[in-house]
């Protein structure tokens, strides 16, 4: 009689070979479908889909029967453990195929989407190319706005109902894997259970990201206020030198990353540029080179060479109008020793360090090739994300860029160049971090339900305000779905991997430079051409999930916790230097503060009082009644007193503010264009002249409803019909 | 000539409360708009709040959210800082500052400070 332990082995050995097969299918119709959006591939895609689900759920439950307490081998046991949690297939048939096609939909739609030019509707753009371009080199802040409202106007208003249903399906999955929310699934990724001081929880992470959120705070806060004064240059009387930044000027269109203000924030503009764009055009380089690049210094440290598989396979260009492409970089394990990289690269100094990153993730996906099946994953998934992280920070270095030509060889450091190369970091490094904290918060409470779906926007930009310091240059209502603008959101990955993946990443960096023999301060070193480094990392990449990653953190860098210390440490030149430059401007911003704030009218109105019993509810039917009866005043006055024909409609009226007592504030826009908004004053006299006929709409008077600023009319209140 | 004068400084016990004033002379306060900073012993200086040119806005350091406020009375030409639920940490020597330009990120003119201790 065997034991279940060795059952169990038999059964996973037998698992794994037919998984192999199954699992390459469905990857492979999965990339085809991404490379080339067509209906058809999405149908094959779906089918592959189905039969690797099919089997999974089948072995899934075939799993079940082998008791984990009776497991001693770690191996077999973690693997277990991975096959007994079921998914997605713990929904019934058609809850799990309206779940597939919402996802299918919403990622289809994020990577179709289009913006088209008001006055030319032939004129489109997709996102990726064109609106990304608007949003990392446009100086106009209208233009920005334009690309940046029409984006969530056009794509996010489509992805709210799918996303209303997305929250509601996926919290029933986690549930039924006896997770309390989706939330909690997705933070099950750190979890660590039965190893002896290596166990982490759940729970755990949401306390570590809390408190290391704490700690990064100060840093964050100097760099707000330095970027702050910076963008008032840029953008004169747009920004409250005590206010929040607007989002739509934070270089790219989510504010995720500040990397492309940094030509507006150099510190030291008359040093050589470190941004090594330029240098990248005039030597001609290309994808190709960008990637080969890339390679050499994997290569360098004692790492493999990618396969030729991946070379012959992988998309590294756009293919244009050939065919639709999901755009947003990824790097795939297929299966079956097939990797590739799908990314739309652009010959930036950006996308040289994006290319270094996807491949850190072919890295790691390569180095656990030959752990069993379940167990070939990041140690979590911040884990995967750094790996490539780690690289970059070596590759951005002045001295690293020196070597491989792209600054020139006379390039000289001193504490200028120190400050400029380290302001270039914060930006995409710091700046990203309260975005990413503050995002996946937002879905951890709307997972949990802490927020009502008719509060989503509301506590988006409360949030966003209160915690980012950023503030929408436009109201959204609820309408709209803003998270779902960005592709993480829209395309189901779990996103405080970013968050966790900084805080290793600079661990690890500490660990793999002191492994290279480097002397001096963490930010000027570059581990490239240290095998002893190289043999580091991959000694930890190697086991996969196969250990905690608690131990393969300690393995590493002597620590079983994320630290935020060596980040912090790595940016201490800089945090002087920016506490010196803030010293005499205001660090910290006012949630009040809005874009369209000076051109808003405050609105109350009493029901109650005015109605007594009467009294009807406000609503957004009585909303949408409110911005029409504006729209109709706007017309009239444009008419009457202009001799101008506008036809404003209710969705130029934009309302912010609503306070459950009924209180609002509004504004009003040219039709068609966000960026016009009509000067107060303007819609003050719009108000005065139409004012009776307003009040009559809502069966009230100047006092009841109450616009604040404009003086009351002459008219007689508001007389009830006879009857 | 432009001039601000701190007062209302002192020693008060862990939770207590003190009013600071800022007197302005030399310009126009509902023109510039007015902050708050402090200085601890051996520490830098630190933004505390500060307040629009119109009064419209206001905003807190992390530290004293909710506990302090600042507000101005354009009549008088004078700034304030109600600071409630004193913390041994608010200890400090407080500085107004008047802004360069109203929509501008820096502050030009500084008072001589007033000194609050915050012990029991």
């Known amino acids: 009689q065997s034991t279940i332990e060795e059952q169990a082995k038999t059964f996973l050995d037998k698992f794994n070979h037919e998984a192999e097969d199954l699992f390459y299918q469905s990857s492979l119709a999965s990339w085809n479908y991404n490379t080339n959006i067509t209906e058809e591939n999405v149908q094959n895609m779906n089918n592959a889909g189905d039969k690797w689900s099919a089997f999974l759920k089948e072995q899934s439950t075939l799993a079940q029967m082998y008791p984990l307490q009776e497991i001693q081998n770690l191996t077999v046991k973690l693997q277990l453990q991975a096959l007994q949690q079921n998914g997605s297939s713990v929904l019934s048939e058609d809850k799990s195929k309206r779940l597939n096609t919402i996802l299918n939909t919403m990622s289809t739609i994020y990577s179709t989407g289009k913006v088209c030019n008001p006055d030319n509707p032939q004129e489109c753009l997709l996102l990726e190319p064109g609106l990304n371009e608007i949003m990392a080199n446009s100086l106009d802040y209208n233009e920005r706005l334009w690309a940046w409202e029409s984006w969530r106007s056009e794509v996010g208003k489509q992805l709210r109902p799918l996303y209303e249903e997305y929250v509601v399906l996926k919290n029933e999955m986690a549930r039924a894997n006896h997770y309390e929310d989706y939330g909690d699934y997705w933070r099950g990724d750190y979890e660590v259970n039965g190893v002896d001081g290596y166990d982490y929880s759940r729970g755990q992470l949401i306390e570590d990201v809390e408190h290391t959120f704490e700690e990064i705070k100060p840093l964050y806060e100097h760099l707000h206020a330095y970027v702050r004064a910076k963008l008032m240059n840029a953008y004169p009387s747009y920004i409250s030198p005590i206010g929040c930044l607007p989002a739509h000027l934070l270089g790219d269109m989510w504010g995720r990353f500040w990397t492309n203000l940094y030509s507006l924030t150099v510190p030291f503009g008359q040093k050589p540029n470190i941004d090594v764009t330029d240098a990248m055009v005039d030597q001609a380089w290309d994808a190709q080179r960008i990637f080969k690049e890339a390679e050499k210094f994997f290569v360098s440290v004692g790492l493999p060479n990618m396969t030729q598989g991946f070379w012959e396979n992988s998309m590294l260009t756009d293919p244009g109008n050939v065919q639709k492409a999901v755009c947003h970089p990824t790097a795939w394990d297929l299966g079956k020793g097939d990797f590739r990289i799908l990314m739309c690269t652009k010959v930036t100094m950006d996308d040289f360090l994006t290319a270094h990153h996807e491949m850190g993730h072919i890295q790691y996906d390569m180095a656990y090739a030959a752990q069993p099946f379940l167990l070939r994953n990041g140690a979590n998934e911040g884990f995967h994300e750094a790996v490539g992280e780690i690289m970059s920070l070596s590759a951005a270095t002045p001295k690293h860029l020196k070597s491989i030509g792209l600054l020139s060889p006379d390039f000289q450091e001193d504490n200028e160049t120190e400050i400029n190369f380290l302001l270039k970091q914060a930006l995409t490094i710091v700046g990203t971090l309260p975005f990413t904290y503050m995002l996946e918060k937002w879905r951890w409470m709307v997972f949990k339900g802490e927020i009502p779906k008719d509060q989503w926007m509301k506590k988006w930009w409360e949030m966003k305000r209160e915690i980012v310091g950023v503030v929408e240059p436009v109201p959204h209502d609820e309408t709209y779905c803003d998270p779902a603008s960005l592709f993480h959101v829209s395309n189901d990955y779990s996103f405080i991997r970013y968050y966790t993946r900084t805080l290793y990443q600079f661990q690890f960096q500490e660990a793999l430079c002191q492994a290279a023999k480097h002397e001096g301060p963490l930010h000027k070193c570059d581990i490239s051409n240290s095998t002893e480094a190289g043999q580091k990392l991959f000694n930890m990449l190697r086991l996969g999930k196969s250990e905690p990653w608690t131990l393969a953190l300690e393995n590493v860098v002597g620590a079983k916790n994320m630290n935020v210390r060596p980040l912090l440490n790595y940016f201490e030149p800089l945090f002087t230097w920016l506490k010196d430059q803030n010293k005499n401007s205001f660090v910290g911003w006012s949630t009040d503060w809005s874009p369209y704030a000076d051109q808003s009218i405050k609105v109350r109105i009493s029901l109650k009082s005015a109605l007594g019993d009467k009294a009807y509810e406000w609503n957004d039917n009585e909303m949408y009644l409110f911005r029409s009866s504006v729209a109709y005043a706007m017309r009239q006055y444009f008419l009457k007193v202009k001799n101008q024909m506008i036809l404003f409609g209710e969705e130029d009226v934009r309302v912010a503010n609503l306070k459950p007592r009924i209180s609002f504030n509004f504004f009003v826009t040219a039709p068609k264009n966000v960026s016009d908004i009509i000067p107060r004053t303007e819609v003050e006299k719009a108000i005065r002249m139409s004012r009776s006929r307003i009040n009559d709409a809502f069966r009230l008077n100047d006092n009841s409803l109450e616009f604040l600023g404009i003086q009351p009319t002459l008219g007689p209140p508001n007389q009830p019909p006879v009857s | 000539e432009v001039q601000l004068v701190e007062s209302g400084g002192g020693l008060v016990q862990p939770g207590g409360s003190l009013r600071l004033s800022c007197a302005a002379s030399?310009?126009?306060?509902?023109?510039?708009?007015m902050g708050w900073f402090r200085q601890a012993p051996g520490k830098e200086r630190e933004s505390v709040a500060a307040?629009?040119?119109?009064?419209?806005?206001?905003a807190y350091a992390d530290s004293v959210k909710g506990r302090f406020t600042i507000s101005a009375d354009n009549s008088k030409n004078t700034a304030y800082l109600q600071m409630n639920s004193l913390k041994p940490e608010d200890t400090a020597v407080y500085y107004c500052?008047?802004?360069?330009?109203?929509?501008?990120?820096?502050?030009?003119?500084w008072g001589q400070g007033t000194l609050v201790t915050v012990s029991s």
């Open positions: 307040i629009s040119w119109n009064g419209d806005f206001t």
């Open positions: 500052a008047k802004r360069a330009n109203p929509t501008g990120a820096y502050f030009d003119y």
């Open positions: 030399g310009f126009s306060l509902d023109y510039y708009g």
